[in-house]
C-alpha cells in the first residue's frame, strides 16, 4: 500500500515529499511536480524504492504545485497519490542602514537570511542628478561594506539587492547626506599677556600628524616664527612676544607632508607699564648717573646692569627699589665706554630691557704731541687733550745745543695747535708742552723738531747751444724741492712764454724746437710745499742757421765743369747737388756729397748746353737754404 503523501515547503524554491509504503515492496517511485495552473510542463523524477522522502528544489517562489506519486512493483504501477502545496515567499532583504558617514565615504550595513544570496548588488546614485550611478557587487556572505569616492555635502540614494542565479530581490533603498569637508575647527586665543599668548583649537581626533603654528608680527616682512606640535595637542602657549604688538597667528594641520589651508587669528599683545627714556650722563671721571621714567607703583624693583662695552668681564648688577627713577653708579674706570641696561620686574615678569651707552670722563690729560709742516724757520705743533678741562697750555722751545734763549708761549686751553715761527734754519729743538687747570698741572710731554736747511737753488748753466735749442742745468739741495718750473721767453717778448714743470729730482732740461739766431731768457725756480723760490735767470742766443754759400762754376769743358762752394765748418752732415738742363730735355742729375767736400767736377753732360745747378746742406736731417747757379758746357 502507498499512502500518507504529505508535501511541505522547503524555503522559497523547494518542496519536501513524505509518504509511507510497505518495506522492500517497490522497485522505484515516479514523482510528478506540476504548477497548479498547468502553465509549464510537469517535472518527473524517478527515485529508488527504498526512499520514503525526497526534496524537490528549483521551484518558483510563492507558487501552488500539484505533486503526484506512484510506485512500481514488478512492472506494475500502484494507484497515484496526489497532494497540493505552495512554495514559500521569496526571502526579502532585511534592513539597510548607513553606519558611518564621512565627507568622502560611508559604511553601509544590512541584514539578510544566511546563505540566501550569491552576491549583493549595490547602486550609489547622486540624488537629483543625471550622473551615472556607481555600481558594485559584494559577496553574499558580507553584511557590511565601505563606499568610498563620494562627494562632500552631497545627497545620495543607495540601493541594495540580493541576487541568486535566477532571482533578484526587491531593492532596499536608503538616503544619506555626506558630511561637509572637515574644517580644522576654531582657532581662538584664550589668554594674552604682554609677552605671550595661549592658542586653543578644535579638530577631529586622529586627523592630523602634527600642527604647524606660525606667529608673525602683522604688517612685518620679517620671517615668521614657526612651531611644530604633535597632532594630539589642542592648546599651545606662545612665549617670547613683543608687548603691545599686533600678531597674526596661523595654524595648519599636516598629514604626511600635506598641509591644510590655514586657520588664522589676529591678536594684539598687551602693553607693558611704561619703562622708558633711559638717560645716562657722566659724573666725574669715575661715575655715571642714570635717569629713567616709569609708570608709578608698577614695578616691584629694577635691575641695572653696567658693563664695559669692549670687555666681556662680569657686569656690575644692581637691584633697586621700584620707587626709584635715578641712581649714581660710582667706581668706574675713567674714559671708558659703558653699556647700561635696565629692566623692571612686574609680578615676576621682566620688562623688555632698555639700554644706553655712555663713557666716563677722561682724567685730564694731554698726549700725541706732533710736529708738522717744518720749514727752515718754523713748524706747527698739534696735540690731544681732555676737552673742557684746561685753562692754558704752556709751550717751551729749547734748542738742543742750548745756544739760543728758551722761548715760552702760553696759549688758550681750547687750542690744540700752535704755529712756532722765527726760528733759525738747520737747528735741533726740543718742544715741551704742559696743561694747566685749577689745582692741576699735567705731566710735561715733549717732542723734537729740526728746522730745515734753507733750500739752495744755484748755478744755472746753459750748454749745448745750437740753432734750434740748448740744454739748461742747475744745482739744488737734495730732497729740498717738490718740483721745478723752467720758463723760456724770447728776448723780444714776441712769442708766448714756454713753461716746463719738472720733478724735484731733476737737474737738467734739454730745450728743442726754438728759433735760430734769436735771444732767449731762461728762468728756473723751485717749489717746496707750494712755496716758490725766486728764479735763477740766464740769457742765451741760439746759433744762426748753418749756411751754404758762394756756389761758383769754373773750368767748363764740352761734357762738364767744376763746382765749388763755401759752408760753415762742422755743421753739415752732407751736401746735395741737383743739375738739370734749363730746357728740361734730359733727366735731372742728383749727387750727394760728404760733409768735408767743398768742390766737385761734373762730367757726362751735353756740349754747349745750359744747366741750372742747386746746392743745399743737410744738418741733423734738416735742409739748409738752397743756393743756385747757371753753367754752360763748352762747344766740342
Amino acid at each position: 500500500e502507498l499512502e500518507n503523501l504529505t508535501v511541505t515547503e522547503v524555503g522559497w524554491d523547494g518542496l519536501r515529499l513524505n509518504w509511507t509504503a510497505a518495506d522492500q515492496a517497490y522497485e522505484h517511485f515516479i514523482i510528478q511536480v506540476q504548477e497548479a495552473n498547468k502553465v509549464e510542463a510537469a517535472r518527473n523524477l524517478t527515485v529508488p524504492g527504498s526512499l520514503r522522502a525526497v526534496d524537490i528544489p528549483g521551484l518558483k517562489a510563492a507558487t501552488p504545485y500539484t505533486v503526484s506519486i506512484y510506485g512500481v512493483i514488478q512492472g506494475y504501477r500502484t494507484p497515484v497519490l496526489s497532494a497540493e502545496a505552495s512554495t514559500g515567499e521569496t526571502p526579502n532583504l532585511g534592513e539597510v542602514v548607513v553606519a558611518e558617514v564621512g565627507w568622502d565615504a560611508l559604511k553601509l550595513n544590512w541584514t539578510a537570511p544566511e546563505g540566501a544570496y550569491e552576491y549583493f548588488f549595490i547602486q550609489v546614485q547622486e540624488a537629483d542628478t543625471v550622473e551615472a550611478a556607481q555600481n558594485l557587487t559584494v559577496p553574499g556572505g558580507l553584511r557590511s561594506t565601505d563606499l568610498p569616492g563620494l562627494k562632500a555635502a552631497t545627497h545620495y540614494t543607495i540601493t541594495i539587492r540580493g541576487v541568486t542565479q535566477d532571482f533578484s530581490t526587491t531593492p532596499l533603498s536608503v538616503e544619506v547626506l555626506t558630511e561637509e569637508v572637515p574644517d580644522m575647527g576654531n582657532l581662538t586665543v584664550t589668554e594674552v599677556s604682554w609677552d605671550a599668548l595661549r592658542l586653543n583649537w578644535t579638530t577631529p581626533d586622529g586627523t592630523y600628524d602634527q600642527f604647524t603654528i606660525q606667529v608673525q608680527e602683522a604688517d612685518q616682512v620679517e620671517e615668521a616664527h614657526n612651531l611644530t606640535v604633535p597632532g594630539s595637542l589642542r592648546s599651545m602657549e606662545i612665549p617670547g612676544l613683543r608687548a603691545g604688538t599686533p600678531y597674526t597667528v596661523t595654524l595648519h594641520g599636516e598629514v604626511r607632508g600635506h598641509s591644510t589651508r590655514p586657520l588664522a587669528v589676529e591678536v594684539v599683545t598687551e602693553d607693558l607699564p611704561q619703562l622708558g627714556d633711559l638717560a645716562v650722563s657722566e659724573v666725574g671721571w669715575d661715575g655715571l648717573r642714570l635717569n629713567w621714567t616709569a609708570a608709578d607703583n608698577a614695578y616691584e624693583h629694577f635691575v641695572i646692569q653696567v658693563q664695559e662695552v669692549n670687555k666681556v668681564e662680569a657686569a656690575q648688577n644692581l637691584t633697586l627699589p621700584g620707587s626709584l627713577r635715578a641712581v649714581d653708579i660710582p667706581g668706574l674706570e675713567a674714559a671708558t665706554p659703558y653699556r647700561v641696561s635696565i629692566y623692571g620686574v612686574i609680578r615676576g615678569y621682566r620688562t623688555p630691557v632698555l639700554s644706553a651707552e655712555a663713557s666716563t670722563a677722561k682724567e685730564p690729560e694731554i698726549g700725541n704731541l706732533n710736529v708738522s709742516d717744518i720749514t727752515p724757520e718754523s713748524f706747527n705743533l698739534s696735540w690731544m687733550a681732555t676737552d673742557g678741562i684746561f685753562e692754558t697750555f704752556t709751550i717751551e722751545i729749547i734748542d738742543s745745543n742750548r745756544l739760543l734763549e728758551t722761548v715760552e708761549y702760553n696759549i688758550s686751553g681750547a687750542e690744540r695747535t700752535a704755529h712756532i715761527s722765527g726760528l733759525p734754519p738747520s737747528t735741533d729743538f726740543i718742544v715741551y708742552l704742559s696743561g694747566l687747570a685749577p689745582s692741576i698741572r699735567t705731566k710735561t710731554i715733549s717732542a723734537t723738531a729740526t728746522t730745515e736747511a734753507l733750500p739752495l737753488l744755484e748755478n744755472l748753466t746753459i750748454s749745448d747751444i745750437n740753432p734750434y735749442g740748448f740744454t739748461v742745468s742747475w744745482m739744488a739741495s737734495e730732497n729740498a724741492f717738490d718740483s721745478f718750473l723752467v720758463t723760456v721767453v724770447d728776448s723780444g717778448k714776441l712769442l708766448d712764454p714756454q713753461e716746463f714743470t719738472l720733478s724735484g729730482t731733476q737737474r737738467k732740461l734739454e730745450l728743442r724746437g726754438l728759433i735760430t739766431g734769436i735771444g732767449y731768457e731762461v728762468m728756473v725756480s723751485g717749489f717746496t710745499q707750494g712755496h716758490q723760490t725766486k728764479p735763477l735767470r740766464a740769457e742765451i742766443v741760439t746759433e744762426a742757421e748753418p749756411e751754404v754759400d758762394n756756389l761758383l762754376v769754373s773750368d767748363a769743358t764740352p761734357d762738364g765743369f767744376r763746382l765749388s762752394w763755401t759752408a760753415d765748418e762742422g755743421v753739415f752732415d752732407n751736401f746735395v747737388l741737383k743739375i738739370r738742363d734749363t730746357k728740361k730735355q734730359s733727366e735731372p742729375l742728383e749727387i750727394t756729397l760728404l760733409a768735408p767736400e767743398r768742390t766737385r767736377d761734373i762730367t757726362g753732360l751735353r756740349e754747349a748746353t745750359e744747366y741750372e745747378i742747386e746746392l743745399y746742406g743737410i744738418s741733423k736731417g734738416r735742409r739748409s737754404q738752397t743756393v743756385s747757379a747757371i753753367a754752360t758746357t763748352a762747344m766740342g
Partner: antibody, heavy 118, light 107 residues
C-alpha cells in the same frame, strides 16, 4: 644627497607573491614617513600604501587592502612592500617615495616594474 | 568624487603662460602638491603647500588654491617643461589621492 633605490620587481603569475624593497640613503630614515606609488603602463599615478617614520602606523589604498603589507626596517634603512594574491591589474612600475614634514613625496626612486601575467 | 580631476591635455606656446587645474573636495581642506613626470622618469615634486618650490625648481612654476580647485601656473613656458603633471592631496581616510594627470605640450 637623498637616494632611493627600488628592487624586487619581475614577472609573476596571477595569485602569486612578490616582495619589493627600497634602499634609502642620505637622510635619517627612521624620522620620515615613506610611501609606495604605482603607475600602470600608459596610465597615471596611483598611491598604494604609506607608513609612518617609526613604522607604527600604516595606510593602504582600498585596491590593495588585505593583499599588500608595507613595512620598514629602520636599522637597515629599507622599506618593503609584500604583495600577495597578485592580479593582472597590479601590473605597474612601483615607486617608493619619501615624505618630509610639510613636504609630501619630496623624493622618489626610479621605480621597479612588476608584471602579473600567466 | 574624492578623486582629483584634471584636464587630460593642455598646450601652450613657447614663452607663454599656462595654467593646469585640479578639482576635488579634499582641496577645500588641503593644499595640493604638484608633480612633473617626463617620459621614462620618476615624478619630481614642483609645488607643495600654499605655494612652495623645492630647491632647484625654477621660479616660473607657481601654485594657487581657491575653493575646491588648485592651479599650477607656468609663466613663460620652456620646451623642457613639456611633461605630464599630476596633482595630489589627502582624503578623509588619510590616504593619498592623485589626479589623472595633465599632458602639457609646449608648441
Amino acid at each position: 644627497e637623498v637616494q632611493l633605490l627600488e628592487s624586487g620587481g619581475g614577472l609573476v603569475q596571477p595569485g602569486g607573491s612578490l616582495r619589493l624593497s627600497c634602499a634609502a640613503s642620505g637622510f635619517t630614515f627612521s624620522s620620515y614617513a615613506m610611501s609606495w606609488v604605482r603607475q600602470a603602463p600608459g596610465k597615471g599615478l596611483e598611491w598604494v600604501s604609506a607608513i609612518s617614520g617609526s613604522g607604527g602606523s600604516t595606510y593602504y589604498a582600498d585596491s590593495v587592502k588585505g593583499r599588500f603589507t608595507i613595512s620598514k626596517d629602520n636599522s637597515k634603512n629599507t622599506l618593503y612592500l609584500q604583495m600577495n594574491s597578485l592580479r593582472a591589474e597590479d601590473t605597474a612600475v612601483y615607486y617608493c617615495a619619501k615624505t618630509s614634514p610639510r613636504v609630501p613625496l619630496d623624493y622618489w626612486g626610479q621605480g621597479t616594474l612588476v608584471t602579473v601575467s600567466s | 568624487s574624492s578623486e582629483l580631476t584634471q584636464d587630460p591635455a593642455v598646450s601652450v606656446a613657447l614663452g607663454q603662460t599656462v595654467r593646469v587645474t585640479c578639482q576635488g573636495d579634499s582641496l577645500r581642506s588641503y593644499y595640493a602638491s604638484w608633480y612633473q613626470q617626463k617620459p621614462g622618469q620618476a615624478p619630481v615634486l614642483v609645488i607643495y603647500g600654499k605655494n612652495n618650490r623645492p630647491s632647484g625648481i625654477p621660479d616660473r612654476f607657481s601654485g594657487s588654491s581657491s575653493g575646491n580647485t588648485a592651479s599650477l601656473t607656468i609663466t613663460g613656458a620652456q620646451a623642457e617643461d613639456e611633461a605630464d603633471y599630476y596633482c595630489n592631496s589627502i582624503n578623509s581616510t588619510r590616504n593619498e589621492v592623485f589626479g589623472g594627470g595633465t599632458k602639457l605640450t609646449v608648441l
